[in-house]
Amino acid sequence: ECVTQLLKDTCFEGGDITTVFTPSAKYCQVVCTYHPRCLLFTFTAESPSEDPTRWFTCVLKDSVTETLPRVNRTAAISGYSFKQCSHQISACNKDIYVDLDMKGINYNSSVAKSAQECQERCTDDVHCHFFTYATRQFPSLEHRNICLLKHTQTGTPTRITKLDKVVSGFSLKSCALSNLACIRDIFPNTVFADSNIDSVMAPDAFVCGRICTHHPGCLFFTFFSQEWPKESQRNLCLLKTSESGLPSTRIKKSKALSGFSLQSCRHSIPVFCHSSFYHDTDFLGEELDIVAAKSHEACQKLCTNAVRCQFFTYTPAQASCNEGKGKCYLKLSSNGSPTKILHGRGGISGYTLRLCKMDNECTTKIKPRIVGGTASVRGEWPWQVTLHTTSPTQRHLCGGSIIGNQWILTAAHCFYGVESPKILRVYSGILNQSEIKEDTSFFGVQEIIIHDQYKMAESGYDIALLKLETTVNYTDSQRPICLPSKGDRNVIYTDCWVTGWGYRKLRDKIQNTLQKAKIPLVTNEECQKRYRGHKITHKMICAGYREGGKDACKGDSGGPLSCKHNEVWHLVGITSWGEGCAQRERPGVYTNVVEYVDWILEKTQAV
């Protein structure tokens, strides 16, 4: 059962796993959620009745019954992890804590104009977990405006104390606000020879990379495959770091793979969700339960529904045994990974999908794309919406993209002459415009947020957000698309599609069926030559065929330029402007979404 509220002046007795320090009970709950075993916690707030050394302690707890006896204690705040909840979870914490000094290893000290600048510095520093900033009112003159970047083994402070005129906060890497590079490549036959901060067992290099990503100290990793010559090291995932933040030595070694933490790309690729099945593989660990199950998929469901289950091994039924049901072994360990991985025993293993809700919904695989043709099929572009105006009569106005359960990203120029959000309707999960009838359900628009630097499409800043009156329940036909990571600025996208119900040629009419066209990106330099009367800025991106014939057109405005990268779809552009439609040598110009990620997050995460 999902319990989100905090229990004031209440302490859970027993079940302690570990104690960490957090600046608030709310953040203690997040830490508990992300810990592999924590189900409950007790936080101690600052209070005159409480020993100051116990202030800000966050005791992480576990219980076989998923609950613990409650005891009354002043200044104690207790609660449950969000593991038991189905809603989206984020580790993003933008709070600034006044008069708190969060202790850790002070590895970098510099002058900063403000706490915000200090936080940005922490966010863009590969080692930084949190910071403390001495304000200009700080008593000691030589420490004023000093920004201390800090890290710890756990990513949380080693202690928190009261200190006047300082502020503290966390890195915003988990808010997708880091400018650090996102290096997704996995390097075969490579060992990174740097210090190990931890080691876990993993079935493949991808899982190893994802574990590295959500380990606070891991910057890169080396994985020894099951063919690795040294038997004791097979399936070993070594989590590594270095002072420079990069591997100091790369050694060529067969059957080893290495890669980097994906912390700067975590909002656009799955890092918690290990959804694959591993055949002829047994995961060893503490046994939670043994249940009969029809298939390994059913076994994974059972594991996902059991809040303490972290991974499983399914042994298929022997012929005609137990009504064709096999054995499903639900398991757990102290760190969420198997204690050993064995091959050749016929088992099928995998992980709980409970952690998938810690990943962005947009990373979920959608059904395979239909190749060829220009008409889309249902569920092919589940983030695409049709935005209608009801004034003077109802009609399709623009396209848009679902980027959150209450947010649509579209183009600012769509709202020329739109006086009020009341005349707008957003339809999702639509393939044919003819499906839209009087009684078709839609989302009302609560607010139109237009970029305040927008003047005209051709000058840039052609971006707008629609805040919906109600939330979108994600299904196969309506779900979000990922925003590109700021760390992905240098990615060369090769699989890009423009979609919309717009005209197929100039002086045409709106199409009934959602149209799609695969179009290549064009460099800004090349694009600038085609549009000598307009500045093609870095905040714009161009796409279109040399020979023309495929392009966005009137009515596609605001819709997505969607590019697939590493099996995940990203909203790379918003259809903005261009010369005619599919004009030869005149590429379409799109708003370059990666340049507006900060703006989008600022507007959508505003309290």
């Epitope: 003047k455 051709e458 000058s459 000598r532 009367g533 307009h534 020979e547 030869r584 040598e585």
Partner: antibody
Framework: QVQLVQSGAEVKKPGASVKVSCKAS????????IEWVRQAPGQGLEWIGV????????NYNENFKDRATLTADTSISTAYMELSRLRSDDTAVYFC?????????????WGQGTTVTVSS | DIVMTQSPDSLAVSLGERATINCKAS??????VAWYQQKPGQPPKLLIY???NRYTGVPDRFSGSGSGTDFTLTISSLQAEDVAVYYC?????????FGGGTKLEIK
């Protein structure tokens, strides 16, 4: 009907500057580009640059980047081309033209031309 | 910059005969080619845009053809008022560039 009317002929000394105006009428001034092209006596056509009156964006031929300045006053639908540090080989007829396409294309309407003579 | 080379430099054709002017681009310019007519003391006048589209009011004896790097302006039946200098222009890539011009006279 669309018209581009340019200012009268100019005689300048080397090193001086000249400013030619081009008044547009008969269409929405901010919806089209204004290009500037020159033609030396007995020679072909040479593009100087373009201004987008809607945004004020300018784009110059590398050969004129340091000496030409294009401006527009949308309140009176007039574009200007100023050429500084004049040399004798700048003697030419200077034309303004409107582009056929909104974003740059063939030039469908031309001014009558302004003769600029540079002589000491 | 893209160089547009026109040929011939001058051409004399009898009234009622066909006149053909060629233009070669130093690289592919797709369909972004226009043709202009200029009479003495006048500004150029647009005849053809996008290789083969006749501009409003241009007589149908003027036609354009070609692709890639080679383009042609054809006057199917020369009239006395067609005596002028003709220029091709590429608009494919900035800066736009013009051919050197072809002087058309009556033989």
């Amino acid at each position: 009907q669309v018209q581009l009317v340019q200012s009268g002929a100019e005689v300048k000394k080397p090193g001086a500057s000249v400013k030619v105006s081009c008044k547009a009428s008969g269409y929405t001034f901010t919806n089209y580009l204004i290009e500037w092209v020159r033609q030396a006596p007995g020679q072909g056509l040479e593009w100087i640059g373009v201004i987008n009156p809607g945004s004020g964006y300018t784009n110059y031929n590398e050969n004129f980047k340091d000496r030409a300045t294009l401006t527009a006053d949308t309140s009176i639908s007039t574009a200007y081309m100023e050429l500084s540090r004049l040399r004798s080989d700048d003697t030419a007829v200077y034309f303004c033209a409107r582009t056929y396409g909104k974003y740059g294309g063939a030039m469908d309407f031309w001014g009558q031309g302004t003769t600029v003579t540079v002589s000491s | 910059d893209i160089v547009m080379t026109q040929s011939p430099d001058s051409l004399a054709v009898s009234l009622g005969e066909r006149a053909t002017i060629n233009c070669k681009a130093s690289q592919s310019v797709s369909n972004d080619v226009a043709w202009y007519q200029q009479k003495p003391g006048q500004p150029p006048k647009l005849l053809i845009y996008y290789i083969s589209n006749r501009y409003t009011g241009v007589p149908d004896r003027f036609s354009g053809s070609g692709s890639g790097t080679d383009f042609t302006l054809t006057i199917s039946s020369l009239q006395a008022e067609d005596v002028a200098v003709y220029y091709c222009q590429q608009d494919y890539s900035s800066p736009p560039t013009f051919g050197g011009g072809t002087k058309l006279e009556i033989k």
